[in-house]
């Protein structure tokens, strides 16, 4: 923490300008009025302050706005944003996409994923929902940032916005996020023809239930292995060998290459070896011929 000292008369600050780079930390603390700093935040980013000096400026803003900075200040934070913690950002109320763009640009190339995730969360809260303009901003300035949002926040995406989401925007989404997005995508693309529908729904299929995957297997989609590997394990396990063969089409030979990776490995263990042999890929590990499979979970449920 910076020591409190009085400001020498010759060092008094009447405006935020380049002369401040020659101020020591304690001089900045004593001589810069927090209200003046807030009013002239748009000048700060043009001045080559050291990280230590930025610490002092942040400290002054924190004192002035203990409940969180107003958006007029946030918009002009510039490199001062790099000093913010997720806890700081959580206090903010941000509604402007210009503010979001400005801060996303500043954070680029820095290890700020937690801060950026919190900022995006605040924007969604501030705007009331994840609307098309917000999604467009995220896809343009922060590919992959959509997946930093919680499933709860993503549930505010209207299906009409889903078309603006590109495959690379979903690259970092986890199963719980795709569980939320998939039904919206299904609704958004429901009027498309078979092949066009598959191209559009493909990035969201990590949230698809078994019955939808089975339905796709009847549509000659020739799913690639990358997409198959992203399906939920629970959605893959009930598929028969014939269904998987239909689903993958010419890509079925890729099962051999991925046979030790989940969900392929888990699926193989659930199939009869006889059925696996029909693929002619040399897949091993299926249930040997003549074995009876007892599903004990069903018996337990009945007792």
């Amino acid at each position: 923490d910076v020591e409190r000292t009085t400001c020498p008369p010759e060092k008094e600050v009447h405006e935020i300008d380049e002369s401040l780079i020659f101020y020591k930390k304690r001089e900045l603390e004593a001589c810069v009025d927090a209200a003046l700093l807030a009013a002239q935040m748009d000048r700060v980013d043009a001045i080559p302050f050291t990280y230590e000096q930025l610490d002092v400026l942040k400290h002054k803003l924190d004192e002035l706005y203990p409940q969180g900075y107003p958006e007029s200040v946030i918009r002009h934070l510039g490199h001062l944003f790099l000093k913010m913690s997720p806890e700081d950002i959580r206090k903010w109320n941000v509604t402007s996409l210009e503010t979001l763009k400005a801060l996303l640009k500043v954070s680029k190339g820095h290890e700020m994923s937690a801060q950026v995730a919190t900022l995006i969360d605040r924007v969604v809260v501030g705007r009331g929902q994840l609307d098309k303009d917000t999604v467009d901003t995220l896809t343009a300035f922060c590919p992959g940032c959509l997946c930093s949002l919680s499933p709860e926040r993503l549930s505010s995406v209207p299906p009409s916005v889903i078309g603006a989401v590109r495959p690379q925007d979903l690259d970092t989404c986890g199963p719980r996020q795709l569980d939320v997005l998939y039904p919206k995508a299904r609704l958004a693309f429901q009027n498309m023809s078979g092949s066009e529908y598959f191209v559009k729904i493909r990035p969201f299929l990590g949230g698809a239930p078994t019955e939808d995957v089975k339905a796709l297997s009847q549509q000659n989609v020739s799913m690639d292995l990358a997409t198959f590997m992203k399906l939920r394990r629970e959605a893959v396990l009930p598929l028969t060998v014939a269904e998987v063969q239909k689903l993958l089409g010419p890509h079925v030979e890729g099962l051999k290459v991925e046979e030790q990776h989940s969900p392929v490995r888990d699926w193989i263990l659930k199939q009869r070896q006889d059925d696996l042999d029909t693929l002619g890929l040399g897949l091993q590990g299926g249930i040997p011929n003549g074995y009876l499979i007892l599903d004990l979970s069903v018996r337990e449920a009945l007792s």
Epitope: M229, K230, H251, K256, V257, L281
Partner: antibody
Framework: EVQLVQSGAEVKKPGASVKVSCKAS????????MDWVRQAPGQGLEWMGD????????IYNQKFNGRVTMTEDKSTSTVYMELSSLRSEDTAVYYC????????????WGQGTTVTVSS | EIVLTQSPATLSLSPGERATLSCSAS???????LSWYQQKPGSSPRLLIY???NLASGIPARFSGSGSGTDYTLTISSLEPEDFAVYYC?????????FGGGTKVEIK
């Protein structure tokens, strides 16, 4: 442009660990597995294992089991290969190589990271 | 594991000549699961041929591949100065993936 950029050369003592990074760009990170292949001085290529960036699932060459760990960070499109209990025979160039899921060939390679193990 | 043996270890030829490189597997390899790489000193390997006979993107047509079962061949119809390098075959028919020991094609 598709690129795999690896971390710089490392010099380690026997018994230590090394962690090599490989940052991918220019393609959908989760559509490709990342494999690691090493090459000892004047020798051929040796496959170490792979990681599926989508699931984080790994497969290791049994020769390295217990010593190699592969991890990924989807947020930065980076994969890591850590090799522990280093010995002089681990002195090699370590390559990351991209492999389209469902195929077994490596269509893009990193520039290689030289790891020297010496007391 | 499947052992891939490449022969000859070194091939001394002149530009314009035909090069034939062999790769023999210790047990049968599914032909879809064999590829060839080229490596020049100080550089990373480069994919030449995948699935036994498919030319990788940007690879000139003088390179070709063939074979099945345990015997595979890489042919360079007419050697160019930039073709002098080490060539590796690679199988992913069974774990662990393995590479051949390499064939060095040098200028005679």
């Amino acid at each position: 442009e598709v690129q795999l950029v690896q971390s710089g050369a490392e010099v380690k003592k026997p018994g230590a660990s090394v962690k090599v990074s490989c940052k991918a760009s220019g393609y959908t990170f989760t559509d490709y597995n990342m494999d690691w292949v090493r090459q000892a001085p004047g020798q051929g290529l040796e496959w170490m294992g792979d990681i599926n960036p989508s699931t984080g699932g790994t497969i290791y060459n049994q020769k390295f089991n217990g010593r190699v760990t592969m991890t990924e960070d989807k947020s930065t499109s980076t994969v890591y290969m850590e090799l522990s209990s280093l010995r002089s025979e681990d002195t090699a160039v370590y390559y990351c190589a991209r492999r389209r899921i469902g195929t077994g060939y490596f269509d893009v390679w990193g520039q290689g990271t030289t790891v020297t193990v010496s007391s | 594991e499947i052992v891939l043996t490449q022969s000859p270890a070194t091939l001394s030829l002149s530009p314009g000549e035909r090069a034939t490189l062999s790769c023999s597997a210790s047990s049968s390899v599914i032909s879809s699961y064999l590829s060839w790489y080229q490596q020049k000193p100080g550089s990373s390997p480069r994919l030449l041929i995948y699935r036994t006979s498919n030319l990788a993107s940007g690879i000139p047509a003088r390179f070709s591949g063939s074979g099945s079962g345990t015997d595979y061949t890489l042919t360079i119809s007419s050697l160019e100065p930039e073709d002098f390098a080490v060539y590796y075959c690679h199988q992913w028919s069974s774990f662990p993936y393995t590479f051949g020991g390499g064939t060095k094609v040098e200028i005679k």
